[in-house]
């Protein structure tokens, strides 16, 4: 799968939240961060993550779509200068300082099951999708026989008012 | 090339069923979500049905919920709706139309030519 | 819901004039918005994408743009060919289209 352009065809500031309405919050310690998985306090604030949507191009060998064998690929970023990364040796998701152009592991091929419930797959392991395990991010392997819309790879999306990326 | 083909549609008295089927071809079908759009004479456009890639997620416009059945075929790269209790007010041309990326249901990229539903005593 | 309204409903210019058509959400959409064209007894035909990408194929006069609740198509300069009603549709939250622009040659 090759990204088709180095920008983002759009982006988009959301708060990530699980099918269960638990936040994914990030906190920094000890110089780097930490992704976790909790219920917020009443008026708590959430965590913003910056989404780069960027087109990319099916391997011409797996679909017979041409130029229209389009996929979506997102980037997560929560702070500037880190994303989300896939660690798929350790099936762990990760949040990394990088510079761009970003690593394969900081690519996650958008699923959206309707509006603002999505889930990420992994551009470096096919079939392996970020989910929910025992309150933590992990990279959880979905066998094709199995419904996408398991809940612990199910995630939402909800607009932010506020265009800032911190 | 990317073609849908819409069949199924006609003249049809109020109440009654009807099946639409849209067949697709140029593209790999299993991995794209569908959808129904219809279009009523001289009018705008209007969404009435949506289903995900591997069949197991539908949408449907309000008016037509607990009345019409979106559903797919992978092997044979056909998409169908079911329309029951058929009304006046759904009579319009129906097209067929793909998503615009795998696995996604944003946007649709491609629209297949229509069959005219007329729901008339 | 999230209702789309488009303004004008009819728009008339001339050849070579530089046109421009709105559509307002009724909640932001985050961009998640597509513009279409459908010339008389044709299906639609999908021009623009999330806001401001061309689809393949499509001329270069066409662009979009926009953010939040306000979306604009311009064509730079309007052709014959151009004649059409245009629809803009979002997909931020649920499926919904426009009422559509007609436009027509002076």
């Known amino acids: 799968m090759s990204i088709t352009g180095i920008s983002p065809i759009t982006e988009y500031l959301a708060s990530l939240s699980t099918y269960n309405d638990q936040s994914i919050t990030f906190a920094l310690e000890d110089e780097s961060y930490e992704i976790y998985v909790e219920d917020l306090k009443k008026d708590e604030k959430k965590d913003k993550v910056l989404l780069s949507y960027y087109e990319s191009q099916h391997p011409s060998n797996e679909s017979g779509d041409g130029v229209d064998g389009k996929m979506l690929m997102v980037t997560l970023s929560p702070t500037k200068d880190f994303w989300l990364h896939a660690n798929n040796k350790e099936h762990s998701v990760e949040l990394h300082k990088s510079e761009k152009p970003l690593p394969d592991q900081a690519f996650f091929v958008l699923h959206n099951m309707h509006s603002n419930s999505v889930s990420f797959e992994s551009k470096t392991d096919p079939g392996v999708f970020i989910g929910v395990k025992d309150n933590h991010l992990a990279l959880i392997k979905v066998d094709s026989s199995e419904n996408l819309s398991t809940e612990n790879i199910l995630f939402k999306l909800s607009e932010t008012h506020h265009h800032h990326h911190h | 090339e990317v073609q849908l083909v819409e069949t199924g549609g006609g003249l049809v008295q109020p109440g009654r069923s009807l099946k639409l089927s849209c067949v697709a071809s140029g593209f790999t079908f299993s991995n794209y979500w569908m959808y129904w759009i219809r279009q009523a004479p001289g009018m705008g456009l209007e969404w009435v049905s949506s289903i995900n890639n591997d069949g197991g997620n539908t949408y449907y416009l309000d008016s037509v919920k607990g009345r019409f059945t979106i559903s797919r075929n992978n092997a044979e790269n056909t998409v169908y709706l079911q329309m029951n209790s058929l009304r006046s007010e759904d009579t319009a041309t129906y097209y067929c139309a793909k998503g615009h990326y795998s696995y996604s249901s944003y946007s649709f990229s491609y629209w297949g030519q229509g069959t005219l539903v007329t729901v008339s005593s | 819901d999230i209702q789309m309204t488009q303004s004008p409903s009819v728009l008339s210019a001339s050849v070579g004039d530089r046109v421009t058509l709105s559509c307002k959400a009724s909640?932001?959409?985050?961009?998640?918005l597509d513009w279409c064209q459908q010339k008389v007894g044709e299906a639609p035909k999908l021009l623009i994408y999330?806001?401001?990408n061309l689809q393949t194929g499509i001329p270069s006069r066409f662009s979009g743009s926009g953010s939040g609740t306000d979306y604009t198509l311009t064509i730079s300069s309007l052709q014959p060919e151009d004649v059409a009603t245009y629809f803009c549709f979002q997909y931020n939250s649920g499926w919904t289209f426009g009422q559509g622009t007609k436009v027509e040659i002076k």
């Open positions: 909640h932001n959409i985050n961009k998640h």
């Open positions: 999330f806001t401001n």
